[in-house]
Amino acid sequence: PEPPTACREKQYLINSQCCSLCQPGQKLVSDCTEFTETECLPCGESEFLDTWNRETHCHQHKYCDPNLGLRVQQKGTSETDTICTCEEGWHCTSEACESCVLHRSCSPGFGVKQIATGVSDTICEPCPVGFFSNVSSAFEKCHPWTSCETKDLVVQQAGTNKTDVVCGPQDRLRA
């Protein structure tokens, strides 16, 4: 029969022959022959391979460097790399999470639209009319202005996006 030019999924072509790839978590020790199967061995300590493969060496697990603000979210296995995340108050600078930066705070006049996570920064929004924020914070939303009317008071000083309204007593009508 004609030697194959292509192989099935999870196989590879070598010496005009289709050999089985090694499963995730295992590395190639020797190619198959006419008489023997592909020989694979599990990855060792601190190593992984996450695909069907013909690699003769496994990859080393990554290190979550605390000097870069990183910590272990999930340790590596023979089939998966270590997953790093950021320490509390920090978030990853990239999808690969190779380093972290401090969550940004929203300045006065801005409130938190979305609190930061280990992988995304704080999202701020300007306080709309009727709302204010007088602090720089990574957690505080814009607060609504105080309703003077519900307290039987009147507005003595208008609110801004950074300050609350100032309420005061209503002027009494003289007889």
Epitope: G44, E45, E47, H57, Q60, C64, P66, R71, K75
Partner: antibody, heavy 120, light 106 residues
């Protein structure tokens, strides 16, 4: 700061069993694989096996399979090595050594070791 | 399982002398770790993943190798380097150690 506190020395009779403990502080054992090493008097180091505290999966050197049982308790951050059918050959220092994934290098933390003496 | 043979088993060196010890595997391994142990103490990781020095290890130490042949070298021996050094492979289970090289001060 990472610390490992291993249980105290044991003097046991031949044929008996012993359970050694290793309590970690400064990291969560579930973020590591816990390895156990043996060092017989005036001898080199040997690897007994390892356990994944996340799921209890173990790997052993074949010569210790049946002799050693590895367990962990993640709530107390403690790993255990149980040795059965003890003989004088089991007289040794036993080390618990985490491969902790928050450390730059593997096997960076070793406890003081537990001395087990098997004698009648 | 992979057998690691360390040589020499015992060696002595004078201060300032260059020291090389080797670790040979019965099969190829991806990397080698080296541990230092002094009498009465627990072992310490000394060189990891073949060539990386652990924290606090003097720069006069180096590690190299690949496949079945690895080595640890001290460029200039000092009194504090006297110890037993063990190689360990972690790329195939079961993990295995060499029998050790005992380095003495001459």
């Amino acid at each position: 700061e990472v610390m490992l506190v291993e249980s105290g020395a044991e003097l046991v009779r031949p044929g008996a069993s012993v359970k050694l403990s290793c309590t970690a502080s400064g990291f969560k054992i579930k973020d590591s694989y816990i390895h156990w090493m043996i060092q017989r008097p005036e001898q080199g180091l040997e690897w007994i096996g390892r356990i994944d505290p996340t799921n209890g999966n173990t790997n052993f050197d074949p010569k210790f399979r049946g002799k050693a049982t590895l367990t962990t308790d993640t709530s107390s951050n403690t790993a255990y090595l149980q040795l059965s059918s003890l003989t004088s050959e089991d007289t040794a220092v036993y080390y618990c050594v985490p491969n902790y994934y928050g450390s730059r290098y593997p096997f960076s933390y070793w406890g003081q070791g537990t001395t087990v003496t098997v004698s009648s | 399982q992979i057998v690691l043979t360390q040589s020499p088993a015992i060696m002595s060196a004078s201060p300032g002398e260059k020291v090389t010890m080797t670790c040979s595997g019965s099969s190829s391994v991806s990397y080698m770790h080296w541990f230092q142990q002094k009498p009465g103490n627990s072992p310490k990781i000394w060189i990891y993943f073949t060539s990386n020095l652990a924290s606090g290890v003097p720069a006069r130490f180096s590690g190299s190798g690949s496949g079945t042949s690895y080595s640890l070298t001290i460029s200039r021996m000092e009194a504090g380097d006297a110890a037993t050094y063990y190689c360990q492979q972690g790329s195939t289970y079961p993990l295995t150690f060499g029998a050790g090289t005992k380095l003495e001060l001459k």
